[in-house]
């Protein structure tokens, strides 16, 4: 069971300092952006991280949403990362959800975060280059210290 607590506005970056944004098709990608670019591209660069209390504490349970014309929430259904047109719900009556991730700081690096899927244990949000694109994907953690699953989260409130 997950119950919604407070939300905060954040900019999410990978460890190469590329900024997460959603494209016109509501797909999450990373690109090099100056602070000015980041502001100019808002609200596509501003993510709503909603925190949830968890009946089985396993880290800070969160959803990641974005509000452009409508609110869309990050999902890892079938291990495919996409934004689905939905508000983060007040309550989720399950111990797993495609939209709930456990946000934890990387041991020894308090400013670096990782996001583990509640649906797929051991799978994390990651940034991977595919052709010309730096994509947000779901990746099984295969090595300790994998930088692709580490992010910085800068609060904008």
């Amino acid at each position: 069971y997950f119950g919604k607590l407070e939300s905060k506005l954040s900019v999410i970056r990978n460890l190469n300092d590329q900024v997460l944004f959603i494209d016109q098709g509501n797909r999450p990608l990373f690109e090099d952006m100056t602070d000015s670019d980041c502001r100019d591209n808002a609200p596509r660069t501003i993510f709503i991280i909603s925190m949830y209390k968890d009946s089985q504490p396993r880290g800070m349970a969160v959803t990641i949403s974005v509000k452009c014309e409508k609110i869309s929430t990050l999902s890892c259904e079938n291990k495919i990362i996409s934004f689905k047109e939905m508000n983060p719900p007040d309550n989720i009556k399950d111990t797993k959800s495609d939209i709930i991730f456990f946000q934890r700081s990387v041991p020894g690096h308090d400013n670096k975060m990782q996001f583990e899927s509640s649906s797929y244990e051991g799978y994390f949000l990651a940034c991977e280059k595919e052709r010309d694109l730096f994509k947000l994907i779901l990746k099984k953690e295969d090595e300790l210290g994998d930088r692709s699953i580490m992010f910085t989260v800068q609060n904008e409130d």
Epitope: G25, R27, K79, I80, E130, D132
Partner: antibody
């Protein structure tokens, strides 16, 4: 709704260059983080990916065809093109232009296809 | 190059029966970048399943995809008359796309 339409000659002589153009309507090539590709299918056979292009111009080709293939894009016309040089009868096929959906690298929109015959 | 093998080559079934089509890769497919297409004579292929198990827009729920790594399956739970066609699998890896040779589903 995105639509793709191939155009170009249906008959090409051996050793010449096959040239096809794909016109995209219902969406802008340059506002998309997807790729635009060509696939062919010889009569009665399977599908073969030829290659694809990003709106910024970077290209990816089938290694077996790479030496003969050029794919280019013209964002002002919302078109992309295929050139295949030194053709032989083995290049006779239905040629499809298509969009590669970069979330899962699947091909979600296809043109209707155009038959190109290589014959003297 | 990651080579895809499809089996069987031809599947002869009757309407209402369950169809199970296999696609095997010579190397593991990263991030489940495997898709399934249906092609009818004289038509372009149509995307059915992407990401190994996600149905494309407008595809009926009798079509289902499963699998990971090197072994993938397309299941048609109850064949409708319009489902008799050729089915291709396709993978993406190292910036390259490859297709399987196809499975023909015909009427028994």
């Amino acid at each position: 709704q995105l639509q793709l339409q191939e155009s170009g000659p249906g008959l090409v002589k051996p050793s010449e260059t096959l040239s096809l153009t794909c016109t995209v309507s219902g969406g802008s090539i340059s506002r998309s983080y997807d790729y635009w590709g060509w696939i062919r299918q010889p009569p009665g056979k399977g599908l073969e990916w030829i290659g694809s292009i990003y709106y910024r111009g970077s290209t990816y080709y089938n290694p077996s065809l790479k030496s003969r293939v050029t794919i280019s894009v013209d964002t002002s016309k919302n078109q992309f093109s295929l050139k295949l040089s030194s053709v032989t009868a083995a290049d006779t096929a239905v040629y499809y232009c298509a969009r590669e959906y970069s979330t899962t690298w699947s091909i979600d929109y296809w043109g209707q296809g155009t038959l190109v015959t290589v014959s003297s | 190059e990651n080579v895809l093998t499809q089996s069987p080559g031809t599947l002869s079934l009757s309407p209402g029966e369950r169809a199970t089509l296999s696609c095997r890769a010579s190397q593991s497919i990263r991030n489940n970048y495997l898709a399934w297409y249906q092609q009818k004579p004289g038509q372009a292929p149509r995307l059915l399943i992407h990401g190994a198990s996600s149905r494309a827009t407008g595809i009926p729920d009798r079509f289902g995809g499963s699998g990971s790594g090197t072994d993938f399956t397309l299941t048609i739970s109850r064949l409708e008359p319009e489902d008799f066609a050729v089915y291709f699998c396709q993978q993406y890896g190292n910036s390259i796309i490859t297709f399987g040779p196809g499975t023909k589903v015909d009427v028994n």
